[in-house]
């Protein structure tokens, strides 16, 4: 009686279950009553990444310069080329087909999370107490200058985009 | 009709060479690997050589390892047997065989 | 290597209608990890080439009659032919397509006793 499932890491062709090729192998041809699958090995520039029955290998992922990429981990034949940025640079979407520059956080906003390949920089308000007066994508909001510490006295108070100034404290004659 | 036809075989001298040929028809060739089997007069059969269906494995028994090459030409349906360093012993009738069908053999004799 | 042993050794002397039955053993188990056992039968007419009869243990070939029937498992298979007619007369040769080196058992003789 020809069978109707196969095992794992089979598959069923003209009423007879043959072995999936390996990952790292495409199928060239079914088994039959005689011999097994014949599965070939992926060329130096392809991969497969699961057991299949598959006749053409998947190319490497191309890491194209031209769009910021660089190779994060080369491609064996049985995984796929990892591509990640260049510095200063992170990927578009969760494929990484091409790489954005990271954003700087404005005067008022410090960065809470500096960038990385894959993401892009995370900006936060700065709160009360601190500042930032600059456009980047690595400096945090600052405290505010502590004039008490330096024996002064607060002249201008500060804001998310400036610091306190500080002045002598007024004599009294 | 499958039909399997041999041919090459003949009369050589010890640590001679011949390429035997099988003419194949009648099913889809590439599909299957194909075996080459001989028998010596009064013999059992002996397994020599076997090619995968895209000719990529190859496949012999150590007392033939090194001396015969089998290959295939998907093109043209044609198997190959070339045997080099040619023993008495090698002497046998030599079968073309995809294990469902068989062709009608080529005679090797080997004689100083 | 794997040694494939056939009995009787050499000769199945047997009456035409009567049941004839030959024995292959292998020196080691010609199961595949897959569970598939490439374990042929092939009949040898005098002055003819091998025809397949049964492959996969079990499996009758296209064109053969029912009455040759084969099974076993793991090293020990059998070929039976339930009632002998002239035709069947030759020698059975079980073969192991499993593990290189393939290899043939020595053959038995099936003959008119």
């Known amino acids: 009686e020809p069978p109707t499932a196969c095992r794992e890491k089979q598959y069923l062709i003209n009423s007879q279950c043959c072995s999936l090729c390996q990952p790292g192998q495409k199928l060239v041809s079914d088994c039959t009553e005689f011999t097994e699958t014949e599965c070939l090995p992926c060329s130096e520039s392809e991969f497969l990444d699961t057991w299949n029955r598959e006749t053409r290998c998947h190319q490497h992922k191309y890491c194209d310069p031209n769009l910021g990429l660089r190779v994060q981990q080369k491609g064996t034949s049985e995984t796929d080329t990892i591509c990640t940025c260049e510095e200063g640079l992170h990927c578009m979407s969760e494929s990484c087909e091409s790489c954005v520059p990271h954003r700087s956080c404005l005067p008022g906003f410090g960065v809470k999370q500096i960038a990385t390949g894959v993401s892009d920089t995370i900006c936060e308000p700065c709160p009360v107490g601190f500042f930032s007066n600059v456009s980047s994508a690595f400096e945090k909001c600052r405290p505010w200058t502590s004039c008490e510490t330096k024996d002064l006295v607060v002249q201008q108070a500060g804001t998310n985009k400036t610091d306190v100034v500080c002045g002598p404290q007024d004599r009294q004659r | 009709q499958v039909k399997l036809e041999e041919s090459g075989g003949g009369l050589v001298k010890p640590g001679g060479s011949l390429k035997l040929s099988c003419a194949a028809s009648?099913?889809?060739?590439?599909?299957?690997?194909m075996s080459w089997v001989r028998q010596s007069p009064g013999e059992r059969l002996e397994w020599v050589a076997e090619?995968?269906?895209?000719?990529?494995?190859?496949y012999y028994p150590d007392t033939v390892t090194g001396r015969f090459t089998i290959s295939r030409d998907n093109a043209n349906n044609t198997l190959y047997l070339e045997v080099s360093s040619l023993r008495s012993e090698d002497t046998a009738m030599y079968y073309c065989?995809?294990?469902?069908?068989w062709g009608q053999g080529t005679l090797v004799t080997v004689s100083a | 290597d794997i040694v494939m042993t056939q009995s009787p050794t050499l000769s199945l002397p047997v009456s035409l209608g009567d049941q004839a039955s030959i024995s292959c053993r292998s020196s080691?188990?010609?199961?595949?990890?897959?569970?598939?056992?490439?374990l042929e039968w092939y009949l040898q007419r005098p002055g003819q080439s091998p025809k397949l009869l049964i492959y996969?243990?079990?499996n009758r070939f296209s064109g053969v009659p029912d009455r040759f029937s084969g099974s076993g498992s793991g090293t020990d298979f059998t070929l039976k032919i339930s009632r002998v007619e002239a035709e069947d007369l030759g020698v059975y040769y079980c073969?192991?397509?499993?593990?290189?080196?393939?290899?043939f058992g020595g053959g038995t003789k099936l003959e008119i006793k």
């Open positions: 996969k243990v079990s």
């Open positions: 090619v995968s269906g895209s000719g990529y494995y190859t």
């Open positions: 065989t995809s294990r469902a069908y």
């Open positions: 073969f192991q397509g499993s593990h290189v080196p393939y290899t």
């Open positions: 080691q188990s010609i199961v595949l990890t897959n569970g598939n056992t490439y």
């Open positions: 009648g099913f889809t060739f590439r599909n299957y690997a």
